[in-house]
Interface confidence: low
């Protein structure tokens, strides 16, 4: 999953959504101004926040690699979410990559779980 | 025990590089924001710059934006400065600092011992 | 203008108490930001004191003593340093920095210098 790095330049178009801080703080869905005086909406489809905040700007949704498919499209307080496809997996030790399953169990062993987007098919040892 | 151990510093030649290093220890470094903050001799502290937890961000200030690069090693707990284009008033100690948080803010709740740059012909 | 301004040097005397200040330029309202103190003895590397943005918001550093305390003033726009029970080894320059705590850059004020006098 590739997030494009964020310019900290960027400003809120005039028509985007203002309110006042509370407590130094801007509700999901929105960043603090430069002053900190206003919480200014992310972009919708562009950036998100999700948590109360007090970011200089929004977070910049994740595109989805090829090789992954768009589960849920990215709102102004949910990021997008990126699934492997069929037939491949992503492992938790290098999620950046969808790995393929294996096709098959080596010789002596069976499969009890099938390949899904968050792991590899599972082999056990046939019981002898 | 949290521990943060840069190295890399030494004289340069004006328009050399130099490439600074942080090991990290004692917590998780994945998931933290990192940052590199220098010192010149007898004057104050300068942040130079920052990068969130899976190094998809990076912030600079403006004396090094464009010469100075950041990068982290997750797999490696490591932090790294590139330095090009070096300039007598890039002289200082460098210190590698841990920041409280994911992203990047202004606590910074450790420092490493810093390790000296000296730009000189 | 710097956006920090902090006194060059202050002192006091052993086992009394001071307040270290950091101003916020006018252009700026401290009332939604959070103030930030780092100490640096000399020889050493700067360790982070606390973090202030009201009474019920604030943190104290790793083993930082309840000696060093934070607090603001909004009408004078300033952020400030209080150490109770002074000690030799509390000599040190002190820097504030202030701003949202997820701000991008950082801006550090130009330090204090203590003097502890015995």
């Known amino acids: 999953i590739t997030r494009q790095s964020l310019d900290p330049q960027r400003r809120a178009a005039p028509q985007q959504k203002r309110s006042s801080p509370i407590e130094g703080l801007c509700p999901p869905g929105h960043h603090i101004s430069e002053d900190s005086r206003e919480c200014i909406s992310c972009k919708y489809g562009q950036d998100y926040s999700t948590h109360w905040n007090d970011f200089l700007f929004c977070l910049r949704c994740t595109k989805c690699d090829s090789g992954e498919v768009e589960v849920n499209s990215c709102t102004t307080t949910r990021n997008t979410v990126c699934q492997c496809e069929e037939g491949t997996f992503r492992e938790e030790d290098s999620p950046e990559i969808c790995r393929k399953c294996r096709t098959g169990c080596p010789r002596g062993m069976v499969k009890v779980k099938d390949c899904t987007p968050w792991s590899d098919i599972e082999c056990v040892h046939k019981e002898s | 025990e949290v521990q943060l151990v840069e190295s890399g510093g030494g004289l340069v030649k004006p328009g050399g590089s130099l490439r600074l290093s942080c090991a990290a220890s004692?917590?998780?470094?994945?998931?933290?924001?990192m940052h590199w903050v220098r010192q010149a001799p007898g004057k104050g502290l300068e942040w130079v710059a920052g990068?969130?937890?899976?190094?998809?961000?990076?912030y600079y200030a403006d004396s090094v934006k464009g010469r100075f690069t950041i990068s982290r090693d997750n797999a490696k707990n490591s932090l790294y400065l590139q330095m090009n284009s070096l300039r007598a008033e890039d002289t200082a100690v460098y210190y590698c600092?841990?920041?409280?948080?994911?992203?990047?803010?202004?606590?910074?709740?450790?420092w490493g011992q810093g390790t000296l740059v000296t730009v000189s012909s | 203008q710097p956006v920090l301004h902090q006194p060059p040097a202050m002192s006091s005397a052993l086992g009394t108490t001071i307040r270290l200040t950091c101003t916020l330029r006018?252009?700026?309202?401290?009332?939604?930001?959070?103030v930030y103190w780092y100490q640096q003895r000399p020889g050493h590397p700067p360790r982070f004191l606390l973090r202030?943005?009201?009474?019920?918001?604030?943190?104290?550093g790793p083993q930082v003593p309840p000696r060093f305390s934070g607090s603001k003033d909004v009408a004078r726009n300033r952020g400030y340093l209080s150490i109770s029970e002074l000690q030799p080894e509390d000599e040190a320059m002190y820097y504030c920095a202030m701003g949202a705590r997820s701000s991008v850059t950082h801006v550090f004020g130009s330090g204090t210098q203590l003097t502890v006098l015995s």
């Open positions: 004692g917590f998780t470094f994945s998931t933290y924001g």
């Open positions: 006018n252009d700026h309202d401290i009332g939604v930001y959070s």
């Open positions: 600092a841990r920041d409280h948080s994911t992203w990047l803010s202004r606590h910074l709740d450790y």
């Open positions: 202030y943005f009201s009474q019920s918001d604030k943190s104290q």
């Open positions: 990068i969130n937890y899976s190094g998809n961000n990076k």
